[in-house]
Protein backbone atom coordinates (compact mmCIF):
# COMPACT_ATOMS: atom_id res chain seq x y z
CA UNK A 1 0.00 0.00 0.00
CA UNK A 2 1.27 3.51 -0.77
CA UNK A 3 3.09 5.37 1.96
CA UNK A 4 2.17 8.98 2.70
CA UNK A 5 5.54 10.44 1.80
CA UNK A 6 7.53 9.63 -1.31
CA UNK A 7 10.83 11.52 -1.17
CA UNK A 8 12.02 13.21 -4.32
CA UNK A 9 15.32 11.96 -5.75
CA UNK A 10 15.53 15.20 -7.70
CA UNK A 11 17.90 17.74 -9.01
CA UNK A 12 17.07 21.25 -7.84
CA UNK A 13 14.16 21.90 -10.17
CA UNK A 14 11.49 23.52 -7.99
CA UNK A 15 8.26 23.94 -9.93
CA UNK A 16 6.93 26.72 -7.70
CA UNK A 17 8.81 29.49 -5.93
CA UNK A 18 9.47 28.80 -2.27
CA UNK A 19 7.31 30.40 0.41
CA UNK A 20 8.60 33.82 1.48
CA UNK A 21 9.14 33.04 5.14
CA UNK A 22 10.25 29.45 4.58
CA UNK A 23 12.19 28.99 7.83
CA UNK A 24 9.30 30.50 9.78
CA UNK A 25 6.95 28.05 8.12
CA UNK A 26 9.27 25.15 8.95
CA UNK A 27 9.41 26.33 12.57
CA UNK A 28 5.64 26.67 12.65
CA UNK A 29 5.13 23.14 11.30
CA UNK A 30 7.60 21.70 13.81
CA UNK A 31 5.81 23.56 16.63
CA UNK A 32 2.46 22.23 15.39
CA UNK A 33 3.77 18.65 15.33
CA UNK A 34 5.38 19.07 18.74
CA UNK A 35 2.14 20.44 20.17
CA UNK A 36 0.14 17.38 19.11
CA UNK A 37 2.77 14.62 19.52
CA UNK A 38 1.92 13.69 23.11
CA UNK A 39 -1.81 13.54 22.39
CA UNK A 40 -1.14 11.26 19.42
CA UNK A 41 1.07 9.01 21.57
CA UNK A 42 -1.61 8.74 24.29
CA UNK A 43 -4.35 8.11 21.73
CA UNK A 44 -2.25 5.36 20.15
CA UNK A 45 -1.31 3.38 23.27
CA UNK A 46 -4.82 3.71 24.69
CA UNK A 47 -6.31 2.27 21.47
CA UNK A 48 -3.98 -0.77 21.66
CA UNK A 49 -5.49 -1.91 24.96
CA UNK A 50 -3.63 -4.00 27.52
CA UNK A 51 -0.76 -4.54 28.12
CA UNK A 52 0.28 -1.21 26.50
CA UNK A 53 -1.09 1.50 28.83
CA UNK A 54 0.50 -0.10 31.89
CA UNK A 55 3.83 -1.02 30.29
CA UNK A 56 4.86 2.14 28.45
CA UNK A 57 8.57 1.97 29.38
CA UNK A 58 8.88 -1.61 28.19
CA UNK A 59 6.58 -1.55 25.13
CA UNK A 60 6.68 2.07 23.97
CA UNK A 61 10.14 3.25 24.93
CA UNK A 62 11.83 5.30 22.17
CA UNK A 63 14.46 2.62 21.44
CA UNK A 64 14.29 2.72 17.64
CA UNK A 65 17.70 1.45 16.52
CA UNK A 66 17.91 2.64 12.90
CA UNK A 67 16.43 6.09 13.49
CA UNK A 68 18.29 8.85 11.58
CA UNK A 69 20.54 10.97 13.84
CA UNK A 70 20.11 14.67 14.56
CA UNK A 71 22.76 17.11 15.75
CA UNK A 72 21.25 20.31 17.12
CA UNK A 73 24.58 22.15 17.07
CA UNK A 74 25.22 21.69 13.33
CA UNK A 75 24.98 24.30 10.60
CA UNK A 76 21.56 25.16 9.16
CA UNK A 77 22.33 23.13 6.04
CA UNK A 78 23.42 20.06 8.05
CA UNK A 79 20.38 20.35 10.30
CA UNK A 80 18.02 20.62 7.33
CA UNK A 81 19.56 17.53 5.67
CA UNK A 82 19.14 15.58 8.93
CA UNK A 83 15.61 16.94 9.36
CA UNK A 84 14.79 15.81 5.83
CA UNK A 85 15.98 12.25 6.61
CA UNK A 86 13.99 12.19 9.85
CA UNK A 87 10.79 13.44 8.19
CA UNK A 88 11.09 10.79 5.44
CA UNK A 89 11.63 8.10 8.09
CA UNK A 90 8.71 9.34 10.19
CA UNK A 91 6.47 9.68 7.15
CA UNK A 92 6.96 6.12 5.97
CA UNK A 93 6.65 4.81 9.53
CA UNK A 94 3.44 6.74 10.05
CA UNK A 95 2.14 5.27 6.78
CA UNK A 96 2.82 1.76 8.08
CA UNK A 97 1.20 2.54 11.44
CA UNK A 98 -1.90 4.01 9.79
CA UNK A 99 -2.25 0.98 7.50
CA UNK A 100 -1.87 -1.42 10.46
CA UNK A 101 -4.26 0.51 12.70
CA UNK A 102 -6.99 0.51 10.06
CA UNK A 103 -6.84 -3.30 10.24
CA UNK A 104 -6.15 -3.76 13.97
CA UNK A 105 -8.37 -0.96 15.29
CA UNK A 106 -10.89 -0.15 12.54
CA UNK A 107 -13.20 1.72 14.93
CA UNK A 108 -10.47 3.99 16.39
CA UNK A 109 -11.46 6.81 14.06
CA UNK A 110 -9.98 9.62 16.15
CA UNK A 111 -6.61 7.82 16.07
CA UNK A 112 -6.83 7.37 12.28
CA UNK A 113 -7.74 11.03 11.90
CA UNK A 114 -4.82 12.21 14.06
CA UNK A 115 -2.39 9.93 12.21
CA UNK A 116 -3.60 11.30 8.87
CA UNK A 117 -3.40 14.91 10.08
CA UNK A 118 0.16 14.34 11.31
CA UNK A 119 1.12 12.77 7.97
CA UNK A 120 -0.32 15.81 6.17
CA UNK A 121 1.82 18.21 8.20
CA UNK A 122 4.90 16.02 7.65
CA UNK A 123 4.23 16.11 3.90
CA UNK A 124 4.14 19.90 3.96
CA UNK A 125 7.23 20.05 6.13
CA UNK A 126 9.12 17.78 3.76
CA UNK A 127 8.21 19.99 0.82
CA UNK A 128 9.39 23.11 2.67
CA UNK A 129 12.65 21.53 3.81
CA UNK A 130 13.40 20.41 0.26
CA UNK A 131 12.57 23.89 -1.03
CA UNK A 132 14.97 25.46 1.46
CA UNK A 133 17.72 22.95 0.67
CA UNK A 134 17.32 23.53 -3.06
CA UNK A 135 16.91 27.30 -3.08
CA UNK A 136 19.58 28.18 -0.55
CA UNK A 137 22.02 25.27 -0.59
CA UNK A 138 21.44 23.69 -4.04
CA UNK A 139 20.91 20.27 -2.45
CA UNK A 140 18.49 18.37 -4.67
CA UNK A 141 19.12 14.85 -3.43
CA UNK A 142 19.40 13.43 0.08
CA UNK A 143 20.08 9.74 0.78
CA UNK A 144 17.35 8.49 3.07
CA UNK A 145 16.33 5.45 5.11
CA UNK A 146 12.75 4.36 5.57
CA UNK A 147 10.85 3.29 8.65
CA UNK A 148 10.64 -0.45 9.41
CA UNK A 149 8.19 -2.45 7.30
CA UNK A 150 5.61 -3.96 9.66
CA UNK A 151 3.75 -5.94 6.98
CA UNK A 152 5.09 -9.32 8.08
CA UNK A 153 4.85 -8.76 11.83
CA UNK A 154 2.32 -10.40 14.12
CA UNK A 155 -0.38 -8.34 15.87
CA UNK A 156 1.65 -7.72 19.02
CA UNK A 157 4.78 -6.69 17.09
CA UNK A 158 2.77 -4.34 14.85
CA UNK A 159 1.36 -2.63 17.93
CA UNK A 160 4.70 -2.55 19.75
CA UNK A 161 6.71 -1.19 16.81
CA UNK A 162 4.07 1.51 16.29
CA UNK A 163 4.18 2.46 19.95
CA UNK A 164 7.99 2.61 20.00
CA UNK A 165 8.01 4.76 16.88
CA UNK A 166 5.47 7.21 18.30
CA UNK A 167 7.44 7.31 21.56
CA UNK A 168 10.52 8.23 19.54
CA UNK A 169 8.52 10.71 17.44
CA UNK A 170 7.32 12.50 20.58
CA UNK A 171 10.90 12.70 21.84
CA UNK A 172 12.62 13.81 18.60
CA UNK A 173 9.97 16.34 17.55
CA UNK A 174 10.57 18.25 20.80
CA UNK A 175 14.30 18.34 20.01
CA UNK A 176 13.65 19.46 16.43
CA UNK A 177 11.20 22.18 17.46
CA UNK A 178 13.82 23.52 19.86
CA UNK A 179 16.69 23.29 17.34
CA UNK A 180 15.02 25.44 14.69
Amino acid sequence: SPLPITPVNATCAIRHPCHNNLMNQIRSQLAQLNGSANALFILYYTAQGEPFPNNLDKLCGPNVTDFPPFHANGTEKAKLVELYRIVVYLGTSLGNITRDQKILNPSALSLHSKLNATADILRGLLSNVLCRLCSKYHVGHVDVTYGPDTSGKDVFQKKKLGCQLLGKYKQIIAVLAQAF
Epitope: G49, E50, P51, D100, L104, S151, G152, K153, D154, V155
Partner: antibody
Framework: EVQLVESGGGLVQPGGSLRLSCAAS?????????MSWVRQAPGKGLEWVSS?????????YYADSVKGRFTISRDNSKNTLYLQMDSLRAEDTAIYYC????????????WGQGTLVTVS | DIQMTQSPSSVSASVGDRVTITCRAS??????LAWYQQKPGKAPKLLIY???SLESGVPSRFSGSGSGTEFTLTISSLQPDDFATYYC????????????FGGGTKVEIK
Protein backbone atom coordinates in the same frame (compact mmCIF):
# COMPACT_ATOMS: atom_id res chain seq x y z
CA GLU B 1 -10.71 -23.08 -6.02
CA VAL B 2 -8.25 -22.06 -3.30
CA GLN B 3 -6.19 -25.07 -2.26
CA LEU B 4 -3.04 -26.10 -0.36
CA VAL B 5 -1.39 -29.45 -1.10
CA GLU B 6 1.47 -30.76 1.04
CA SER B 7 4.09 -33.30 -0.06
CA GLY B 8 7.49 -34.62 0.97
CA GLY B 9 6.55 -36.55 4.10
CA GLY B 10 7.90 -40.03 4.78
CA LEU B 11 10.04 -42.20 7.03
CA VAL B 12 13.40 -40.84 8.15
CA GLN B 13 15.99 -41.89 10.74
CA PRO B 14 16.75 -39.77 13.82
CA GLY B 15 19.31 -37.09 12.91
CA GLY B 16 18.17 -37.16 9.30
CA SER B 17 16.64 -34.47 7.11
CA LEU B 18 13.47 -33.99 5.11
CA ARG B 19 11.99 -31.17 3.06
CA LEU B 20 8.26 -30.62 2.99
CA SER B 21 6.52 -28.67 0.23
CA CYS B 22 3.15 -26.98 0.11
CA ALA B 23 1.81 -25.97 -3.29
CA ALA B 24 -0.81 -23.22 -3.28
CA SER B 25 -3.37 -22.77 -6.02
CA UNK B 26 -6.26 -20.37 -6.50
CA UNK B 27 -4.42 -17.40 -4.97
CA UNK B 28 -1.07 -15.68 -5.40
CA UNK B 29 1.78 -15.68 -2.89
CA UNK B 30 2.45 -12.08 -3.88
CA UNK B 31 -0.56 -10.91 -1.87
CA UNK B 32 -0.48 -9.78 1.77
CA UNK B 33 -0.44 -13.29 3.24
CA UNK B 34 1.17 -15.47 5.89
CA MET B 35 1.91 -19.14 5.40
CA SER B 36 2.51 -21.50 8.31
CA TRP B 37 3.27 -25.07 9.27
CA VAL B 38 1.24 -26.69 12.05
CA ARG B 39 1.86 -30.25 13.20
CA GLN B 40 -0.04 -32.92 15.09
CA ALA B 41 1.69 -35.86 16.75
CA PRO B 42 -0.30 -39.13 16.70
CA GLY B 43 -3.22 -38.85 19.15
CA LYS B 44 -2.09 -35.39 20.30
CA GLY B 45 -3.18 -31.79 19.82
CA LEU B 46 -2.19 -29.13 17.29
CA GLU B 47 1.22 -27.48 17.61
CA TRP B 48 2.25 -24.39 15.67
CA VAL B 49 5.69 -24.91 14.09
CA SER B 50 6.61 -21.92 11.94
CA SER B 51 5.27 -19.00 9.89
CA UNK B 52 6.56 -16.84 7.05
CA UNK B 53 5.29 -13.64 5.50
CA UNK B 54 5.17 -14.16 1.73
CA UNK B 55 5.55 -10.42 1.01
CA UNK B 56 8.82 -8.59 0.43
CA UNK B 57 10.15 -8.67 3.99
CA UNK B 58 9.80 -12.46 4.32
CA UNK B 59 9.63 -12.29 8.13
CA UNK B 60 9.92 -15.73 9.74
CA TYR B 61 8.76 -17.12 13.09
CA TYR B 62 9.57 -20.43 14.78
CA ALA B 63 8.37 -22.39 17.80
CA ASP B 64 11.04 -23.00 20.43
CA SER B 65 10.85 -26.76 19.84
CA VAL B 66 12.13 -26.46 16.24
CA LYS B 67 14.21 -23.27 16.30
CA GLY B 68 17.68 -23.85 14.84
CA ARG B 69 16.66 -27.17 13.26
CA PHE B 70 13.82 -26.24 10.90
CA THR B 71 13.86 -23.57 8.19
CA ILE B 72 10.75 -22.16 6.57
CA SER B 73 11.00 -20.60 3.11
CA ARG B 74 8.88 -19.80 0.09
CA ASP B 75 9.24 -19.50 -3.66
CA ASN B 76 6.71 -16.90 -4.77
CA SER B 77 7.29 -17.66 -8.46
CA LYS B 78 6.26 -21.28 -7.83
CA ASN B 79 3.57 -20.37 -5.26
CA THR B 80 5.16 -22.94 -2.96
CA LEU B 81 6.00 -23.04 0.73
CA TYR B 82 8.80 -25.23 2.13
CA LEU B 83 9.89 -26.61 5.48
CA GLN B 84 13.46 -27.87 5.64
CA MET B 85 13.70 -30.19 8.66
CA ASP B 86 17.18 -31.11 9.90
CA SER B 87 18.43 -33.01 12.97
CA LEU B 88 15.09 -34.78 13.17
CA ARG B 89 14.04 -36.39 16.44
CA ALA B 90 11.46 -39.04 17.32
CA GLU B 91 9.28 -36.30 18.83
CA ASP B 92 9.03 -34.61 15.43
CA THR B 93 6.86 -37.52 14.24
CA ALA B 94 3.56 -35.94 13.23
CA ILE B 95 1.18 -34.98 10.48
CA TYR B 96 2.42 -31.63 9.13
CA TYR B 97 -0.25 -29.24 7.90
CA CYS B 98 0.32 -26.21 5.73
CA UNK B 99 -1.96 -23.31 6.71
CA UNK B 100 -2.62 -19.82 5.38
CA UNK B 101 -3.67 -16.59 7.06
CA UNK B 102 -4.70 -13.11 5.90
CA UNK B 103 -3.37 -9.86 7.39
CA UNK B 104 -3.14 -9.42 10.41
CA UNK B 105 -2.44 -13.20 10.46
CA UNK B 106 -4.39 -13.92 13.62
CA UNK B 107 -6.21 -17.05 12.41
CA UNK B 108 -5.71 -19.81 9.83
CA UNK B 109 -8.51 -19.73 7.28
CA UNK B 110 -6.93 -22.14 4.82
CA TRP B 111 -5.54 -25.63 5.50
CA GLY B 112 -3.91 -28.40 3.49
CA GLN B 113 -4.73 -32.09 3.98
CA GLY B 114 -1.44 -32.81 5.77
CA THR B 115 1.61 -35.01 5.16
CA LEU B 116 2.93 -37.61 7.61
CA VAL B 117 6.51 -37.47 8.84
CA THR B 118 7.78 -40.48 10.77
CA VAL B 119 11.14 -40.32 12.55
CA SER B 120 12.18 -43.83 13.57
CA ASP C 1 5.10 -16.00 27.29
CA ILE C 2 1.52 -16.73 26.35
CA GLN C 3 0.16 -20.08 27.49
CA MET C 4 -3.22 -21.32 26.28
CA THR C 5 -5.29 -23.56 28.55
CA GLN C 6 -8.45 -25.25 27.34
CA SER C 7 -11.07 -26.90 29.53
CA PRO C 8 -12.48 -29.44 29.82
CA SER C 9 -10.17 -31.81 27.93
CA SER C 10 -13.21 -33.93 27.07
CA VAL C 11 -16.97 -33.68 27.44
CA SER C 12 -19.70 -36.30 26.99
CA ALA C 13 -22.95 -34.88 25.67
CA SER C 14 -26.13 -35.87 23.83
CA VAL C 15 -27.69 -34.52 20.65
CA GLY C 16 -29.58 -31.33 21.51
CA ASP C 17 -27.37 -30.49 24.51
CA ARG C 18 -25.77 -27.09 25.01
CA VAL C 19 -21.99 -27.43 25.18
CA THR C 20 -19.56 -24.79 26.43
CA ILE C 21 -15.79 -24.97 26.07
CA THR C 22 -13.46 -22.50 27.79
CA CYS C 23 -10.08 -21.21 26.70
CA ARG C 24 -7.81 -19.12 28.94
CA ALA C 25 -4.72 -17.17 27.97
CA SER C 26 -2.01 -16.55 30.58
CA UNK C 27 -1.87 -12.90 29.48
CA UNK C 28 -4.07 -10.64 27.44
CA UNK C 29 -4.51 -11.49 23.76
CA UNK C 30 -7.16 -8.80 23.25
CA UNK C 31 -9.80 -10.39 20.97
CA UNK C 32 -7.39 -12.35 18.79
CA LEU C 33 -8.75 -15.83 19.42
CA ALA C 34 -9.99 -18.43 16.94
CA TRP C 35 -11.80 -21.76 17.34
CA TYR C 36 -11.34 -24.81 15.13
CA GLN C 37 -13.16 -28.12 14.73
CA GLN C 38 -11.20 -31.24 13.81
CA LYS C 39 -12.49 -34.67 12.91
CA PRO C 40 -10.28 -37.81 12.86
CA GLY C 41 -8.02 -37.95 9.81
CA LYS C 42 -9.03 -34.47 8.66
CA ALA C 43 -7.44 -31.03 8.76
CA PRO C 44 -8.80 -28.49 11.27
CA LYS C 45 -11.69 -26.30 10.12
CA LEU C 46 -12.05 -22.66 11.18
CA LEU C 47 -15.31 -21.97 13.06
CA ILE C 48 -14.85 -18.64 14.85
CA TYR C 49 -12.28 -15.87 14.45
CA UNK C 50 -11.56 -12.69 16.46
CA UNK C 51 -13.33 -14.28 19.45
CA UNK C 52 -16.89 -13.95 18.15
CA SER C 53 -17.01 -13.72 14.33
CA LEU C 54 -18.58 -16.72 12.65
CA GLU C 55 -16.67 -18.05 9.63
CA SER C 56 -18.69 -18.16 6.42
CA GLY C 57 -20.65 -21.41 6.03
CA VAL C 58 -20.46 -22.35 9.73
CA PRO C 59 -23.87 -23.08 11.34
CA SER C 60 -25.21 -20.39 13.68
CA ARG C 61 -25.46 -22.86 16.58
CA PHE C 62 -21.73 -22.17 17.05
CA SER C 63 -20.90 -18.94 18.85
CA GLY C 64 -17.88 -17.43 20.53
CA SER C 65 -17.43 -14.81 23.22
CA GLY C 66 -14.83 -13.26 25.49
CA SER C 67 -11.87 -10.91 25.31
CA GLY C 68 -8.61 -10.32 27.13
CA THR C 69 -7.77 -13.66 28.70
CA GLU C 70 -11.01 -15.65 28.92
CA PHE C 71 -12.97 -17.02 25.97
CA THR C 72 -15.78 -19.49 25.38
CA LEU C 73 -17.09 -21.52 22.47
CA THR C 74 -20.75 -22.48 22.75
CA ILE C 75 -22.66 -25.04 20.71
CA SER C 76 -26.29 -24.14 21.45
CA SER C 77 -27.84 -27.46 20.36
CA LEU C 78 -25.40 -30.27 19.66
CA GLN C 79 -25.90 -32.07 16.35
CA PRO C 80 -24.56 -35.51 15.30
CA ASP C 81 -22.04 -33.80 12.99
CA ASP C 82 -20.58 -31.82 15.93
CA PHE C 83 -18.89 -34.75 17.68
CA ALA C 84 -15.24 -33.81 17.15
CA THR C 85 -12.24 -32.20 18.84
CA TYR C 86 -12.22 -28.42 19.25
CA TYR C 87 -9.13 -26.21 19.55
CA CYS C 88 -8.67 -22.58 20.50
CA UNK C 89 -5.81 -20.58 18.99
CA UNK C 90 -4.36 -17.21 19.95
CA UNK C 91 -3.31 -15.02 17.05
CA UNK C 92 -1.81 -12.18 19.05
CA UNK C 93 1.85 -13.18 19.29
CA UNK C 94 4.01 -15.77 17.54
CA UNK C 95 7.24 -15.46 19.49
CA UNK C 96 9.23 -18.68 19.91
CA UNK C 97 8.08 -19.29 23.48
CA UNK C 98 4.41 -18.51 22.91
CA UNK C 99 1.82 -21.24 22.95
CA UNK C 100 -0.44 -20.78 19.90
CA PHE C 101 -3.01 -23.57 20.33
CA GLY C 102 -4.95 -24.79 23.33
CA GLY C 103 -4.74 -28.48 24.25
CA GLY C 104 -8.06 -29.37 22.65
CA THR C 105 -11.49 -30.52 23.88
CA LYS C 106 -12.97 -33.78 22.64
CA VAL C 107 -16.78 -33.74 22.42
CA GLU C 108 -17.98 -37.34 22.69
CA ILE C 109 -21.38 -39.03 22.54
CA LYS C 110 -22.84 -39.72 25.97
Amino acid sequence: EVQLVESGGGLVQPGGSLRLSCAASGFSFSTDYWMSWVRQAPGKGLEWVSSIYVGTSGDTYYADSVKGRFTISRDNSKNTLYLQMDSLRAEDTAIYYCAGADNPYDYFNLWGQGTLVTVS
Amino acid sequence: DIQMTQSPSSVSASVGDRVTITCRASETISGYLAWYQQKPGKAPKLLIYRASSLESGVPSRFSGSGSGTEFTLTISSLQPDDFATYYCQQGYSYSDTDNVFGGGTKVEIK
